[in-house]
C-alpha cells in the first residue's frame, strides 16, 4: 500500500511540476521593469524567453518575438536549452511512469520492469527538476549581474543636463513558478527512486523452496497469501479466490522483508 | 462617431466640492484607460487624473492628490471626477478623454469650464 | 517630472511653406523595451479640445495628413509641417507620455500669414 502510495504521489507531484516548467517556459515575466525608483509607471517593460513586452498604463500590450538566434545572449540560450531538455525529459518520464504505476495492469509485465521503469522515471523526474532550477537560477544570477551594472550606470548625463533613466529589471513570476516547478519535479522523482526500492522483488534473498512430504507434494511459496498444491504459478498478481473485496495491495504476491523460509 | 459630453461644471467658492462627468458613446469604453485634462485660462495643458480600464489603477499628479477622485461606470459608459477642496488654481476647462497606443489621448471631449472664485 | 520645453512660442508664415516646431524634454522619452519614444503631438485649434496628430513620436495618427511628420529621439523632437494650409492655424503641444506625471510642453502658436 506504501509503495503504491509512494509512487503514485511521487508521479502527481512530477506531472504538477513539469507542467509548472512548461508554464514557466513559457511565460513572458521572466524578468520585470524595476519599480523601485519609480512605482507609478505609465510603461512596464517585461521579459521572457521567446520575447519581450511592453505593457502602457493606456492598456494597450505589445510583445515582439526574438526573431534572432545568432544575435541573442549565449546565457539566455543556455537557459533555452536547460528549460527545454527539462520539459523533454520530464514528459518522458511521465510517459514511462505511467506504464511503471503498479495500479495499471498492462499484459504481464513483470514486476522487475515496473520497477526498473520507476527507477528510470524518477532518475528522469531528478534530472529534469535539477535542469529547470539550473535553468532559472542561470537566468536569475544573469538578471542580478546586470541590476547591479546598470545601477552603476543608473544616469547617463549629458553635459549634466540631461538625464536618461535606465530600465532595470528584476525577478519575474516565472522564475519563481520555474523554482517550485523544478524543486516538484525533483521531490516527486524521488518519492519514484523510493518507490522503486519498494517494487523491486529481492530474487537473491527470496527464491521459492520446495519441501517434500511423504503424502503429497506441497510448495511452500514465502510472500504469497495461499499456498498452493503442486507447483502452481501463483507467484504474480493473480488471485486464486477472492472471497470478498480486497484492494490491489492485499492481493500481491510480492516477498516481503519479513518473509523467510 | 466617438462622443465624449462632460458636464457638471461651473462657478464654485475655494473650499467647495464638484462632481464632474463625462458620458462617452460609439466606443468601447470599457476597453478604455480614460484621463482628465484641464486647460488653464493661459492656455496650459495639465494632466488631472488617469483610471486603468478595470478601475483597478488611478493615477495623479501631485497637485491633485488627495483632492481629486477619478471613478468610472463601465455600465453607465461614464467617467467621473470628484473634487473637493477646490482652490483659485483649479480653474480651468476641463476635458475627458480616452487613452490610445503610446498612452496618447486619442478621444476628447468638448470640456466643462469649472471657475473656482470667491 | 520630466520637463518639456517647445519653441518657438509662436509662428507666424506664409501658406505653403514648411514648418519646423521643437520640443525638448528633460530626461529621455525613450522606452528600451520597444525602443518607441513616448511622446506626443497634439494640435488645438481656436475654440475646440486638443487633437491628436502623432504618437510614439512618430506614428501619424489615423486620419492624419501626410504633411505633418514627427521625428526625433530621446530628448529632442521635432514636428514638421511639410506645406502649411490655412486650416492648420492652431497651437501645438508635445506631450511626455512615458512617465507620470504626464507633463505637456506649453504650446508653440501657428499663425498664417
Known amino acids: 500500500m506504501a509503495v503504491t502510495a509512494c509512487q503514485g504521489l511521487g508521479f502527481v507531484v512530477s506531472l504538477i511540476g513539469i507542467a509548472g516548467i512548461i508554464a514557466a517556459t513559457c511565460m513572458d515575466q521572466w524578468s520585470t521593469q524595476d519599480l523601485y525608483n519609480n512605482p507609478v509607471t505609465a510603461v512596464f517593460n517585461y521579459q521572457g524567453l521567446w520575447r519581450s513586452c511592453v505593457r502602457e498604463s493606456s492598456g494597450f500590450t505589445e510583445c515582439r518575438g526574438y526573431f534572432t538566434l545568432l544575435g541573442l545572449p549565449a546565457m539566455l540560450q543556455a537557459v533555452r536549452a536547460l528549460m527545454i531538455v527539462g520539459i523533454v525529459l520530464g514528459a518522458i518520464g511521465l510517459l514511462v511512469s505511467i506504464f511503471a504505476l503498479k495500479c495499471i495492469r498492462i499484459g504481464s509485465m513483470e514486476d522487475s520492469a515496473k520497477a526498473n521503469m520507476t527507477l528510470t522515471s524518477g532518475i528522469m523526474f531528478i534530472v529534469s527538476g535539477l535542469c529547470a532550477i539550473a535553468g532559472v537560477s542561470v537566468f536569475a544570477n544573469m538578471l542580478v549581474t546586470n541590476f547591479w551594472m546598470s545601477t552603476a550606470n543608473m544616469y547617463t548625463g549629458m553635459g549634466g543636463m540631461v538625464q536618461t533613466v535606465q530600465t532595470r529589471y528584476t525577478f519575474g513570476a516565472a522564475l519563481f513558478v520555474g523554482w517550485v516547478a523544478g524543486g516538484l519535479t525533483l521531490i516527486g522523482g524521488v518519492m519514484m527512486c523510493i518507490a522503486c526500492r519498494g517494487l523491486a522483488p529481492e530474487e537473491t534473498n527470496y527464491k521459492a523452496v520446495s519441501y517434500h512430504a511423504s503424502g503429497h507434494s506441497v510448495a511452500y511459496k514465502p510472500g504469497g497469501f495461499k499456498a498452493s498444491t503442486g507447483f502452481g504459478s501463483n507467484t504474480k498478481n493473480k488471485k486464486i479466490y477472492d472471497g470478498g473485496a480486497r484492494t490491489e495491495d492485499e492481493v500481491q504476491s510480492y516477498p516481503s522483508k519479513h518473509d523467510y523460509v | 462617431e466617438v462622443m465624449l459630453v462632460e458636464s457638471g461644471g461651473g462657478l464654485m467658492k475655494p473650499g467647495g466640492s464638484l462632481k464632474l462627468s463625462c458620458a462617452a458613446s460609439?466606443?468601447?469604453?470599457?476597453?478604455?484607460?480614460m484621463s482628465w485634462v484641464r486647460q488653464t485660462p493661459e492656455k496650459r495643458l495639465e494632466w488631472v487624473a488617469t483610471?486603468?480600464?478595470?478601475?483597478?489603477?488611478?493615477y495623479y499628479p501631485d497637485s491633485v492628490k488627495g483632492r481629486f477622485t477619478i471613478s468610472r461606470d463601465n455600465a453607465k459608459n461614464t467617467l467621473y471626477l470628484q473634487m473637493s477642496s477646490l482652490r483659485s488654481e483649479d480653474t480651468a476647462m476641463y476635458y475627458c478623454?480616452?487613452?490610445?497606443?503610446?498612452?496618447?489621448?486619442?478621444?476628447w471631449g468638448q470640456g466643462t469650464s469649472v471657475t473656482v472664485s470667491s | 517630472d520630466i520637463v518639456m520645453t517647445q519653441s518657438p512660442s509662436s509662428l507666424t508664415v506664409t501658406a505653403g511653406e514648411k514648418v519646423t516646431l521643437s520640443c525638448k524634454s528633460s530626461q529621455s522619452l525613450l522606452n528600451s523595451g520597444n525602443q518607441k519614444n513616448y511622446l506626443t503631438w497634439y494640435q488645438q485649434k481656436p475654440g475646440q479640445p486638443p487633437k491628436l496628430l502623432i504618437y510614439?513620436?512618430?506614428t501619424r495618427e489615423s486620419g492624419v495628413p501626410d504633411r505633418f511628420t514627427g521625428s526625433g529621439s530621446g530628448t529632442d523632437f521635432i514636428l514638421t509641417i511639410n506645406s502649411v494650409q490655412a486650416e492648420d492655424l492652431a497651437v501645438y503641444y508635445c506631450?511626455?507620455?512615458?512617465?507620470?506625471?504626464?507633463?505637456f510642453g506649453s504650446g508653440t502658436k501657428l499663425e498664417i500669414k
Open positions: 506631450q511626455n507620455a512615458y512617465s507620470y506625471p504626464f507633463t
Open positions: 460609439e466606443f468601447t469604453f470599457s476597453n478604455y484607460a
Open positions: 510614439w513620436a512618430s
Open positions: 483610471i486603468s480600464s478595470g478601475r483597478s489603477s488611478t
Open positions: 478623454a480616452g487613452l490610445g497606443r503610446g498612452n496618447a489621448m486619442e478621444y
